[in-house]
Amino acid sequence: EEELQVIQPDKSVLVAAGETATLRCTATSLIPVGPIQWFRGAGPGRELIYNQKEGHFPRVTTVSDLTKRNNMDFPIRIGNITPADAGTYYCVKFRKGSPDDVEFKSGAGTELSVRAKPSAPVVSGPAARATPQHTVSFTCESHGFSPRDITLKWFKNGNELSDFQTNVDPVGESVSYSIHSTAKVVLTREDVHSQVICEVAHVTLQGDPLRGTANLSETIRVPPTLEVTQQPVRAENQVNVTCQVRKFYPQRLQLTWLENGNVSRTETASTVTENKDGTYNWMSWLLVNVSAHRDDVKLTCQVEHDGQPAVSKSHDLKVSAHPKEQGSNTAAENTGSNER
């Protein structure tokens, strides 16, 4: 009778995370009598995975009928595989001993590799909004994938970006990996409706990459342009002055009218109109009673947009010496200035 050998026919086994791994093992002899044990790793720190003789191994099931006469097959199934299960598994024959069984012979080992899908990429932008022509950074993170090889691309509105840096960690061997990438994007005034997309391709995804998106509407601030104009006289001694607030984003905006530097009225943008590019327009008007003023009036439209320092535009109303006599022909010179 030839001495027993432990045969592990599979040098390696590749399993997708969440599935079941089958590890095969055959003994070439019934002699010596004794149980089979499965270990992950070798040496003193090896981890017991299954012991035919005793123990409770809820994730492990035996494939063959261990009690069948002449049985020399000892495969096991390990359920719900995770990347942490990766490693080399050894089938070890023990010889019946007293009081304890004695290790007799080990198989050559089967390397279990786990394919794990990357998590959905999470894209995050800068903490504070930025204005057009500024460069902002976006980060993309995905975790828990294996093997290490992975491809990451950045897009803005379908156009691939080239200015980015990517790291896969850890550098050495690991049960699973993470990817971190930072892309630089130059903002334009038309970016309110723009999207930045991070796309991750991995062998586990069967050619169907995962995508994470960020809307530039959460990143961009488009400051308004102001225009103050005087409208034709509405009634005797009354002038209607309007402040056009154009092309701003986001909507959060407060407007204050000043007459000769004194606050006349403050209002918050409410009934705005939206432009095709996603920015907003708004108009505010002020009715000025010219007869109440002896001297010229400096009207200022002051706008505080999205918590930023106020911008303003002024308009000078020239008041004549005898405004009552001029009636509806009151003259008013329009001299505007943009004050910030």
């Epitope: 009778e1 019934l30 009598v33 012991n51 005793e54 261990l66 009690t67 069948k68 019946k96």
Partner: antibody, heavy 119, light 110 residues
Framework: QVQLVQSGAEVKKPGASVKVSCKAS????????INWVRQAPGQGLEWIAM????????HYNQIFKDRATLTTDTSTSTAYMELRSLRSDDTAVYYC????????????WGRGTLVTVSS | DIVLTQSPDSLAVSLGERATINCRAS??????????IFWYQQKPGQPPKLLIY???NRDSGVPDRFSGSGSGTDFTLTISSLQAEDVAVYYC????????FGQGTKLEIK
């Protein structure tokens, strides 16, 4: 350490039944066959039957097929052998034994249970 | 059914001497490359103890003065140098089919 602990001695009248228990410890009960063997006073060993606790598959010696029933309770790792229609020549020590190699052999034995059948 | 016949029924051997017990099967017990014969030792008041499995393999903890041999139908248990603690009844058992035992051989010291 494998241990098989058997129930205590029994005295039965002819025609009665006896149920002997064998509680296993130190190993996974469902992975190994349990054999039952008896030995009449001053006589040799006589194999009765065997059971696989994993699925209750049984094999009986033809002599005992109609009178013996083997069962197991996997929740308590206990094997049972019931013998019916007892006769005086059933007086014997009844052993349970575990087959560690699935060779239909008897590697570990209980201490035995003496069953006396007497009117 | 396979019948096992042991010989002799009893045997007296001097301490330090060789003891030989035979077991003959009514038909071959060889199958799948193995001889399905087992030897047990039973001392008074104790359960039997497995000595040899598959004809020639010593069980764990069995002194190497015990050996088994044979093939097919004829098998032998040999104690190379009898010790006082070897006094017992020895049984062969087959498992080529369902198990049966030989009638036993009583070994005593001469």
């Amino acid at each position: 350490q494998v241990q098989l602990v058997q129930s205590g001695a029994e005295v039965k009248k002819p025609g009665a039944s006896v149920k002997v228990s064998c509680k296993a410890s130190g190993y996974t009960f469902t992975n190994y066959w349990i054999n039952w063997v008896r030995q009449a006073p001053g006589q040799g060993l006589e194999w009765i039957a065997m059971i696989d606790p994993s699925d209750s598959e049984t094999h009986y010696n033809q002599i005992f097929k109609d009178r013996a029933t083997l069962t197991t309770d996997t929740s308590t790792s206990t094997a049972y052998m019931e013998l019916r229609s007892l006769r005086s020549d059933d007086t014997a020590v009844y052993y349970c034994a575990m087959d560690y190699g699935s060779l239909y052999a008897m590697d570990y034995w209980g201490r035995g249970t003496l069953v006396t059948v007497s009117s | 059914d396979i019948v096992l016949t042991q010989s002799p029924d009893s045997l007296a051997v001097s301490l330090g001497e060789r003891a030989t017990i035979n077991c003959r099967a009514s038909q071959s017990v060889r199958s799948s490359g193995y001889n399905w014969i087992f030897w047990y030792q039973q001392k008074p008041g104790q359960p039997p103890k497995l000595l040899i499995y598959l004809a020639s393999n010593r069980d764990s903890g069995v002194p190497d003065r015990f050996s088994g041999s044979g093939s097919g139908t004829d098998f032998t248990l040999t104690i190379s140098s009898l010790q006082a603690e070897d006094v017992a009844v020895y049984y062969c058992q087959h498992s080529r089919e369902l198990p049966t035992f030989g009638q036993g051989t009583k070994l005593e010291i001469k």
